[in-house]
Amino acid sequence: KKVVLGKKGDTVELTCNASQKKNTQFHWKNSNQIKILGIQGLFLTKGPSKLSDRADSRKSLWDQGCFSMIIKNLKIEDSDTYICEVENKKEEVELLVFGLTANSDTHLLEGQSLTLTLESPPGSSPSVKCRSPGGKNIQGGRTISVPQLERQDSGTWTCTVSQDQKTVEFKIDIVVLAFQKASSTVYKKEGEQVEFSFPLAFTLEKLTGSGELWWQAERASSSKSWITFDLKNKEVSVKRVTQDPKLQMGKKLPLHLTLPQALPQYAGSGNLTLALEAKTGKLHQEVNLVVMRATQFQENLTCEVWGPTSPKLTLSLKLENKGATVSKQAKAVWVLNPEAGMWQCLLSDSGQVLLESNIKVVPTW
């Protein structure tokens, strides 16, 4: 007998073909011999089965000897053996209906777990294989678990249910609630305006919650809260902000903070947290601020950086159009009795300049 797999809530066509391409009598029955539908004259008649109001047939195909039954809004309990009686012969079709659903909300925070549960008819022994948008493959039986969701797990998961060498495909949209980046670093010269941006890796119709930026300055012994804010329907409103520094915050998404001036005492790292309404847990993004200062005091030209820099970064002082250079994998470099001219202080990572500050040394007569 033929096996057909269907999806819960979906529509399925069970085919039944007569050898002669002409309109003839036919009936569809279930395994209990209860009539579902059939032909009487040119009229489609429905029987007393529970399926009748969801079953249909295409009159336009009867002339071609095709007497299929279409079942809409499939339920797991529609799984059964259906019998098509046409031309004094019986065709049997076994219909197996499966459902695959996420146990919780499909909008999950990064790090949370996802469980997919398979609903299947009694007596079936299906296998399930799911593929994440990032190409991760997970296999299972009645349940599939993804212990720790990552940003790249956001999107459409494709799950294939297999039974009796037949397959049916489910698509489940999963939204991982996270910031686009786990961490970002802003490099600024002293005195420059600093822009911090915290774009989200998802979009929601209504986005409501509250957030806070905690800051650990390199020079400070403890961290402090720089700003707290509310988010209501994608509108941002500041609740509380420190006096020093006096941060400004954009009223619309993406979350955007402006520090009027980059100063050495602000260099350090922060953690922006966002708690979303009706969600347990918080979204996090780390942000770092590196500040550069170039100064000349008496016969000493100094370049310094403050903030979280990796040991492999190079700090250099270089005289423009001249070979004179001093470089160190350190947070400060200096030149004694520097030549007159335009000096450049460069913070580089493997030759790529991250930050640059120019200082003019005037000749001393």
Epitope: K7, D10, T11, V12, E13, L42, R58, K59, S60, I71
Partner: antibody, heavy 115, light 107 residues
Framework: QVQLQQWGAGLLKPSETLSLTCAVY????????WSWIRQSPGKGLEWIGE???????NYNPSLKSRVTISVDTSKDQFSLKLSSVTAADTAVYYC?????????WGQGSLVTVSS | DIQMTQSPSSVSASVGDRVTITCRAS??????LAWYQQKPGKAPKLLIY???SFQSGVPSRFSGSGSGTDFTLTISSLQTDDFATYYC?????????FGQGTKLEIK
């Protein structure tokens, strides 16, 4: 609730091939047949043809020699190609879902054939 | 092909009126007939199928009847929203065919 969204070139020259695609959102793609219908002031509503998930097609005999309907089940999309168009093919083209009746329709695409 | 002929091609009526539109098939189609409503710039909308069954969400002032070759669509009490063009369609055999339409206008 199922939604059908269609797109394709709107202005063609005679002898070119008309190409339209329809995407199905929020409903079952399997079990149904997916049709193309056109509407012109001269000929009213005219059924062009249909396809199902497994690629089985039925065409209007009056257009059969020029029509190809194809399906991409991975995207829940189906497409219409009508070759060697003339000014008589100028119409609003609709995609629609059907078992016996057209119960869901696309927004329509105006296709103009002009030299 | 089965020809579907609608009459009248246009009708003028007032709010509250009872309106009947007829559709005749060139050969017997039992009850394999549907009625659609279309407003300017929009796609047709299914009102009645199987000659007399209501599509969900369709107001009860719309009703369909008939079998074989002669069918009618009746609007018991016209509302402003009902002024549109109405089409019948047969699903008895390929190719599916439509009537030429009946335009319902405000008197």
């Amino acid at each position: 609730q199922v939604q059908l969204q269609q797109w394709g070139a709107g202005l063609l020259k005679p002898s070119e091939t008309l190409s339209l695609t329809c995407a199905v959102y929020g409903g079952s793609f399997s079990g149904y047949y997916w049709s193309w219908i056109r509407q012109s002031p001269g000929k009213g509503l005219e059924w062009i043809g249909e396809i199902n998930q497994s690629g089985s097609t039925n065409y209007n005999p009056s257009l059969k020699s020029r029509v190809t309907i194809s399906v991409d089940t991975s995207k829940d999309q189906f497409s219409l190609k009508l070759s060697s168009v003339t000014a008589a093919d100028t119409a609003v083209y609709y995609c629609a879902r059907v078992i016996n009746w057209f119960d869901s329709w696309g927004q329509g695409s105006l296709v103009t054939v002009s030299s | 092909d089965i020809q579907m002929t609608q009459s009248p091609s246009s009708v003028s009526a007032s709010v509250g009126d009872r309106v009947t539109i007829t559709c005749r098939a060139s050969q017997g189609i039992s009850s394999w007939l549907a009625w659609y409503q279309q407003k300017p710039g929009k796609a047709p909308k299914l009102l009645i199928y199987d000659a007399s069954s209501f599509q969900s969400g369709v107001p009860s002032r719309f009703s369909g009847s008939g079998s074989g070759t002669d069918f009618t669509l009746t609007i018991s009490s016209l509302q402003t929203d009902d002024f549109a063009t109405y089409y019948c369609q047969q699903a008895n055999s390929f190719p599916y065919t439509f009537g030429q339409g009946t335009k319902l206008e405000i008197k």
